[in-house]
C-alpha cells in the first residue's frame, strides 16, 4: 500500500515534468546532476538527486508563477514509507555530484525516464508472464 502511494506520486510527477518541458526556455540554463542508467536499488537515491537539484525559473515573461509552482511540486517529499530501506541503499549508491551534469531539457528528460523506470518495475513486480524483454 505504501509502495503504491509512492508510485502514484511518481505518475503525477511525470505529468509535472512534462509540463516543465514546455517551459525549458524559461528555466535558468544551469547544468544540473542528471542520473542516467541508474543501477538497481539506487533508484530512490537518484530520485533524491533530481529533487535536490537547483532547477530555477529564469524570471522572464509571464510563465514564472506556473514554473515555480511546478518546481515546488517536483520537490515535495514523497510519503516516508520505506525510508529506512532507501537510506540503506543510499550508502552504496553514487553521490549526486558524481552524476553527469546536464542542462534543464536533458535533466527533465532523464528525470522522467527514471520515474517511468520506477513505475514500470512496480507494475512488472506484480505481473507474471507479460514481460518479454
Amino acid at each position: 500500500q505504501g509502495q503504491d502511494r509512492h508510485m502514484i506520486r511518481m505518475r503525477q510527477l511525470i505529468d509535472i515534468v512534462d509540463q516543465l518541458k514546455n517551459y525549458v526556455n524559461d528555466l535558468v540554463p544551469e547544468f544540473l546532476p542528471a542520473p542516467e542508467d541508474v543501477e538497481t536499488n539506487c533508484e530512490w537515491s537518484a530520485f533524491s538527486c533530481f529533487q535536490k537539484a537547483q532547477l530555477k525559473s529564469a524570471n522572464t515573461g509571464n510563465n514564472e508563477r506556473i514554473i515555480n509552482v511546478s518546481i515546488k511540486k517536483l520537490k515535495r517529499k514523497p510519503p516516508s514509507t520505506n525510508a529506512g530501506r532507501r537510506q540503506k541503499h543510499r550508502l552504496t549508491c553514487p553521490s549526486c555530484d558524481s552524476y553527469e551534469k546536464k542542462p534543464p531539457k536533458e535533466f527533465l528528460e532523464r528525470f522522467k525516464s527514471l520515474l517511468q523506470k520506477m513505475i514500470h518495475q512496480h507494475l512488472s513486480s506484480r505481473t507474471h508472464g507479460s514481460e518479454d524483454s
Epitope: 502514484i8 505518475r11 528528460e109 517511468q116 507494475l123 506484480r126 505481473t127 518479454d132
Partner: antibody
Framework: QVQLQESGPGLVKPSETLSLTCTVS????????WGWIRQPPGKGLEWIGY???????NYNPSLKRRVTISVDTSRNQFSLKLSSVTAADTAVYYC???????????WGQGTLVTVSS | DIQMTQSPSSVSASVGDRVTITCRAS??????LAWYQHKPGKAPKLLIY???SLQSGVPSRFSGSGSGTDFTLTISSLQPEDFATYYC?????????FGGGTKVEIK
C-alpha cells in the same frame, strides 16, 4: 503536440501476419512507452502490448505467442506484427503513447483491419 | 487478469446535466485507474489518470474519484462536445484492461 498515425493493409487473409506501423510526429520516440490497443466491432478496447523507447516489451498474455512490437527510432516509428490471424482479429487497431507507463495520453485515430479470405 | 465492469452501459442526458459513470474492478487496484473519452472515428482522449488526477488540457467539469475497487467519473455540467463513449482502464498490473464502455447520448 504529439500525433500518431497508423498505417498498413486493411485486409489480411486468415493464417497470415498482420503488420501495422505507427508514425509519431511532434515528439521523439526515443523516450516513453509506445503501445497498441484494438477494438473488435461492437466490443470494448483490448490492450495488445507496448514497447519502451529502449526496446523492452510487455504483451497481453492472451496474444503473447503471436505478437511482436518493435521500434525504429531513426524513423520515429514503431510497429505491430500479429501472426496466424483469424476472423477474431478483425478490429480497429490503435497506436498510442504512454508517458505515464500506466495509461495512454496520445492516440492515433485507428485503422480498421479485416481478416477475411 | 483484472476485470473492469462499467455501469450504466449507456445513459441519456441533456446539456447542463450532471452525469456519473461508475467502474468496478474485480480486485483492488488502489488508485491505478484511468478514464478515456472516445468519439467515433476520432482518437481516444485521456481524461483522468490515477483515479483523480486531471490530464493537462482537460476541462475541470470532468472529475474522478474512488480507490480500491469502486471508481466514479463525473461530468458536472454536460456540454454538447461531451456526448461520447467513456472507458475506464485498470493500470496496476499487466495486462492493462479496459471496461466495456459507457455511451453518453443526447436525451
Amino acid at each position: 503536440q504529439v500525433q500518431l498515425q497508423e498505417s498498413g493493409p486493411g485486409l489480411v487473409k486468415p493464417s497470415e501476419t498482420l503488420s501495422l506501423t505507427c508514425t509519431v510526429s511532434g515528439g521523439s520516440i526515443s523516450s516513453d512507452f509506445w503501445g497498441w490497443i484494438r477494438q473488435p466491432p461492437g466490443k470494448g478496447l483490448e490492450w495488445i502490448g507496448y514497447i519502451s523507447s529502449r526496446g523492452s516489451t510487455n504483451y497481453n498474455p492472451s496474444l503473447k505467442r503471436r505478437v511482436t512490437i518493435s521500434v525504429d527510432t531513426s524513423r520515429n516509428q514503431f510497429s505491430l506484427k500479429l501472426s496466424s490471424v483469424t476472423a477474431a482479429d478483425t478490429a480497429v487497431y490503435y497506436c498510442a503513447r504512454s508517458a505515464g507507463v500506466t495509461d495512454f495520453d496520445f492516440w492515433g485515430q485507428g485503422t480498421l483491419v479485416t481478416v477475411s479470405s | 487478469d483484472i476485470q473492469m465492469t462499467q455501469s450504466p452501459s449507456s445513459v441519456s442526458a441533456s446539456v447542463g446535466d450532471r452525469v456519473t459513470i461508475t467502474c468496478r474492478a474485480s480486485q483492488g487496484i488502489s488508485s491505478w485507474l484511468a478514464w478515456y473519452q472516445h468519439k467515433p472515428g476520432k482518437a481516444p482522449k485521456l481524461l483522468i489518470y490515477v483515479a483523480s488526477s486531471l490530464q493537462s488540457g482537460v476541462p475541470s467539469r470532468f472529475s474522478g474519484s474512488g480507490s480500491g475497487t469502486d471508481f466514479t467519473l463525473t461530468i458536472s455540467s454536460l456540454q454538447p462536445e461531451d456526448f461520447a463513449t467513456y472507458y475506464c482502464q485498470a493500470a496496476n498490473s499487466f495486462p492493462l484492461t479496459f471496461g466495456g464502455g459507457t455511451k453518453v447520448e443526447i436525451k
